[in-house]
Amino acid sequence: MMTGTIETTGNISAEKGGSIILQCHLSSTTAQVTQVNWEQQDQLLAICNADLGWHISPSFKDRVAPGPGLGLTLQSLTVNDTGEYFCIYHTYPDGTYTGRIFLEVLESSVAEHGARFQIP
């Protein structure tokens, strides 16, 4: 029985050219996390494997950094980075937990003047 829950940063916004941290946290379960996948639509950005560590997809290597923790840092953001991101926790014995984050990348002038989803 899957008892865990995933908390995420939810809907967030960031400025074009800036960076953002995507964070998920799995709680309320004693299941062992064997791997965390970070995915955007159908593209795999990175994995953090409990045995083999972090591995970033070659196509994102220049703009994605591992961490902090099991999170993922996106750098040099473009408007094309707007969209849904998923943290997929592979656990034993529970199975798979998935969290969703929506990122909106804004032109700098918009972000400076009270954008939706703005983080203080």
Partner: nanobody, 117 residues
């Protein structure tokens, strides 16, 4: 599933070299990284080295940096661990591991490396 078979272990004197091989077969298409871990008698299994199958980027445990080199032959679905300047503390069972997008990791049966002084 992905099957992993290690080879190349053995008995060697301190300062010597060995080359471990790990051949992968089965559903290897979504294998994202491969690597090596080791377990010495009475100790926890520990990370040794890993390589990303996409671009060949590598990572090493501090204890083996400069002595061990991991490499991959994607055409043969094989990963190698060249171990030089071996020390008695490198004595362990060495396991090959694979990380897959599906989250279904795989392990080999292990190969024994014994370094004598």
């Amino acid at each position: 599933e992905v099957q992993l078979v290690e080879s190349g272990g053995g008995l060697v004197q301190a300062g010597g070299s060995l080359r471990l091989s790990c051949a992968a077969s089965g559903r290897t298409f979504d294998t994202y990284a491969m690597g090596w871990l080791r377990q010495a008698p009475g100790k926890e299994r520990e990370f040794v080295s890993a390589i990303s199958t996409g671009d060949g980027s590598t990572n090493y445990a501090d204890s083996v940096k400069g002595r061990f080199t991991i490499s991959a032959d994607n055409a043969k679905n094989t990963v190698y661990l060249q171990m030089n300047s071996l020390k008695p503390e490198d004595t362990a069972v060495y396991y090959c591991a694979a990380a897959r997008r599906s989250g279904r990791g795989s392990w080999g049966q292990g190969t024994q490396v014994t370094v004598t002084s």
